[in-house]
């Protein structure tokens, strides 16, 4: 079996963690978040070729069926395997509050 | 906000559970699985337009950034939210064994 972390498409082309710099406006948060004003958003981007970072048996099945029926079954897709928490200072009716979100920033990635 | 389960692209076009009929050969299992000979594989297929079955805050961020930077950030993608277990009768060196897999068949879907 091919090494699950070696990308056959070339460096950086396969499913991995990327960082995208975004403002509150970019995120659509300007009306309800006060801080941070900018975020280094970590997300999972890249192709999922056969055997690359397969999350589970379902991903293996999906890849096999994709090769058989590419018009019906899509290839596995690159999604977060886990998340890093993030705190936001949110606007409220009376001022601000702190809220921690556990599902905001991707921590690592796999193919499902 | 649009109803998270109403597909704006038309019936059946958005992320949902599909069933694909597959043989052991299709799945690449013929050399190690004895039964079942055929499987009704449930998997998640379909588009993930804005606000449709968003799994979490990360999916919202991803969609907003995709609209801003479609060449850099892909749209959220349709993946299993949970799985149904499945029992396989596996070939072994000495005969057969029963093995339950918890991550084989998608049970429901969302966009991440």
């Amino acid at each position: 079996a091919r090494n699950g972390d070696r990308c056959p498409l070339g460096p950086g082309r396969c499913c991995r963690l990327h960082t995208v710099h975004a403002s509150l406006e970019d995120l659509g948060w300007a009306d309800w978040v006060l801080s941070p004003r900018e975020v280094q958003v970590t997300m999972c981007i890249g192709a999922c070729p056969s055997q690359f970072r397969e999350a589970n048996m379902h991903a293996q099945i999906k890849m096999n069926l994709h090769r058989l029926k590419p018009d019906t079954v899509p290839a596995p897709c690159c999604v977060p395997a886990s998340y890093n928490p993030m705190v936001l200072i949110q606007k409220t009716d009376t001022g601000v509050s702190l809220q921690t979100y556990d599902d905001l920033l991707a921590k690592d990635c796999h193919c499902v | 906000a649009r109803n998270g389960d109403r597909c704006p692209l038309g019936p059946g076009r958005c992320c949902r559970l599909h069933t694909v009929h597959a043989s052991l050969e299709d799945l690449g299992w013929a050399d190690w699985v004895l039964s079942p000979r055929e499987v009704q594989v449930t998997m998640c297929i379909g588009a993930c337009p804005s606000q449709f079955r968003e799994a979490n805050m990360h999916a919202q961020i991803k969609m907003n950034l995709h609209r801003l930077k479609p060449d850099t950030v892909p749209a959220p993608c349709c993946v299993p939210a949970s799985y149904n277990p499945m029992v396989l009768i596996q070939k072994t060196d000495t005969g057969v064994s029963l093995q339950t897999y918890d991550d084989l068949l998608a049970k429901d879907c969302h966009c991440v």
């Epitope: 006060l34 801080s35 941070p36 975020v39 890093n84 928490p85 993030m86 705190v87 936001l88 200072i89 601000v96 702190l98 921690t100 905001l104 920033l105 | -």
Partner: antibody
């Protein structure tokens, strides 16, 4: 809920190194946007910010005390440590640690009194 | 370093009075100013973030305003429990700096 607890030696002699520990609960030191800062307050005086450390290990120090300060964290133990070397009587104060969120001290510990005396 | 200068240093007022404390930054800090209340024998407590946003749980008699270099904390109707020292703090740039404090007393 969020809690911070400072611990330290109480009494030191001049020229010694002060070692303080802040143990936190109710939040994670690895949460994006979260930091811990140290602030001190001599008796009857105002607040003086000393140092802080962020979730990503970025560190900042009071410019006047930078050469004497070291801040570090152990995320697995939920602890932040501050060291202040070559102490003098002028370093006698109540030392507070506080949860810092994007520059703002949202929650404070009760403080620990440190006295420097020969 | 950015200096934060509070005035007055001490303020005496009666219950029910409107009280104003000012804080002046030595350079533009936008709205990156917080206010804290410290009662005797206690740690400081956050009141205001980003110059004008009250922290959750803070009574609505407390309000903040200002931007750039001039900031104000106002107590619309002074209560006996508001006796404390009040501090402003800038977080526009490091090093973080506090004002010297304003001691609020009841007449």
């Amino acid at each position: 809920q969020v809690q911070l607890q400072e611990s330290g030696p109480g009494l030191l002699k001049p020229s010694q190194t002060l070692s303080l520990t802040c143990t936190v609960s109710g939040f994670s030191l690895s949460t994006y946007g979260m930091g811990v800062g140290w602030i001190r307050q001599p008796a009857g005086k105002g607040l003086e910010w000393l140092a802080n450390i962020w979730w990503n290990d970025d560190k900042y120090y009071n410019s006047a005390l930078k050469s004497r300060l070291t801040i570090s964290k152990d995320t697995s133990k939920n602890q932040v440590s501050l060291k202040l070397s070559s102490v003098t009587a002028a370093d006698t104060a109540v030392y507070y640690c506080a949860q810092e969120v994007y520059g703002w001290f949202a929650y404070w510990g009760q403080g620990t009194l440190v006295t420097v005396s020969s | 370093d950015i200096q934060m200068t509070q005035s007055p240093s001490t303020l005496s007022a009666s219950v029910g009075d409107r009280v104003t404390i000012t804080c002046k930054a030595s350079q533009n800090v936008g709205t990156n100013v917080a206010w804290y209340q410290q009662k005797p024998g206690q740690p400081p407590k956050a009141l205001i973030y980003s110059a004008s946003y009250r922290y959750s749980g803070v009574p609505d008699r407390f309000s903040g305003s200002g931007s750039g270099t001039d900031f104000t904390l106002t107590i619309s109707s002074l209560q006996a429990e508001d006796v404390a020292v009040y501090y402003c703090q800038q977080y526009n740039s490091y090093p973080l700096t506090f004002g010297q404090g304003t001691k609020l007393e009841i007449k």
